[in-house]
């Protein structure tokens, strides 16, 4: 098994992740591991020399870069917040602030916007990843209600009056809870004709 630097006639290297083809010398050389950069380029007589990234800089992958990338903070003006700090091996990890979704994506989220409200009777469909897209409002399922205009409110189950020793005064809808009353209270006049004797 050849150790870099080694000759390459077909311009490809055995380990594409950790080696690269250097065209001037027509050889395969080592890439630098994450958290480092090339401080001296390889040649036929010596392999790549790597050095650790300085503070506030990083390289995420095996590379043959002659510089490290500058760490960037999460921009609150763009609706972003930090979830993990920058290290020599990883850029700052950002996400959309609560109540926001990613509106512009270029390899990573660059701009977040406020989530749209879901009207009463609906709730935001749950997504695999929070903040990935705007709300898609879906109707509350049977036996549930939601009575606000909100980006995050969830449909709640209708109250079961009997569980509280009460009786149903008015059935719940998608936008309102069941109305309960004390069984000794008279029915409202508009409902008096519907009582079972």
């Amino acid at each position: 098994q050849a150790v870099p630097p080694y000759a390459s006639e077909n311009q490809t290297c055995r380990d594409q992740e950790k080696e690269y083809y250097e065209p001037q010398h027509r050889i395969c050389c080592s890439r630098c591991p994450p958290g480092t950069y090339v401080s001296a380029k390889c040649s036929r007589i010596r392999d790549t020399v790597c050095a650790t990234c300085a503070e506030n800089s990083y390289n995420e992958h095996w590379n043959y870069l002659t510089i490290c990338q500058l760490c960037r903070p999460c921009d609150p003006v763009m609706g972003l917040e930090e979830i993990a700090p920058c290290t020599s091996k990883r850029k700052t990890q950002c996400r959309c602030q609560p109540g926001m979704f990613c509106a512009a994506w270029a390899l990573e989220c660059t701009h977040c916007e406020l989530l749209s409200d879901c009207p009463p009777g609906t709730e935001a469909e749950l997504k695999d990843e929070v903040g990935k897209g705007n709300n898609h409002c879906v109707p509350c399922k049977a036996g549930h209600f939601q009575n606000t205009s909100s980006p995050s409110a969830r449909c709640q189950p209708h109250t079961r009056c009997e569980n509280q020793g009460l009786v149903e005064a008015a059935p719940g809808t998608a936008q309102s809870d069941t109305t309960c009353k004390n069984p000794l209270e008279p029915l409202p006049p508009e409902m008096s004709g519907t009582m079972l004797m």
Epitope: A7, E9, P23, Q24, H25, R26, S43, R44, I45, R46
Partner: antibody, heavy 120, light 107 residues
Amino acid sequence: EVQLVESGGGLVKPGGSLRLSCAASGFTFSDYYMYWFRQAPGKGLEWVATISDGGSYTYYPDSVKGRFTISRDNAKNSLYLQMSSLRAEDTAVYYCAREENGNFYYFDYWGQGTTVTVSS
Amino acid sequence: DIQMTQSPSSLSASVGDRVTITCKAGQDIKSYLSWYQQKPWKAPKILIYYATRLADGVPSRFSGSGSGTDYTLTISSLQPEDFATYYCLQHGESPWTFGGGTKLEIK
């Protein structure tokens, strides 16, 4: 038979430009890295420029970087050296050469050379 | 840049003599050294590559040796056609650099 024939040399004033050519024959030109070397009167040899087989990569020593441009036309089996901002110290015989295609990287064939004189 | 120091710069010898020319590199060049012969108004011609290997068509009286930083070209028995200038070239690391040359003259 492998042949490399340079042309385009001549007398040029300081600051002027010149384009050298090297016509290749007897081998598959597009498979080889090509080079220009030079030799000043009564002096030793000096590397001037390199171009990769497909022409994507070019390399120069600091002495000519930014002033000289190597190029090639594989369809015409031709190598070129565009020289600009010429100086008196660029006066030399210019040779094109082929780099061996294996793993030893020596220069197995050279042209006969073309003379460039930079003088006012 | 890797400095190549070639010696002697000139040498007088007779037909039949054994001649040795040396090249010292500024650092280990791992045998990426070739030797060239040049006659007046002619192009250089490859003699030895990878420090010790004889190029095609080159007479066996020419040989190369050495490793690391020190390399030698030997002509075992000089012939009249061998009077020329000889250059070593390191091509281990760009920029490629030549020795200053050794002019071999008839004594």
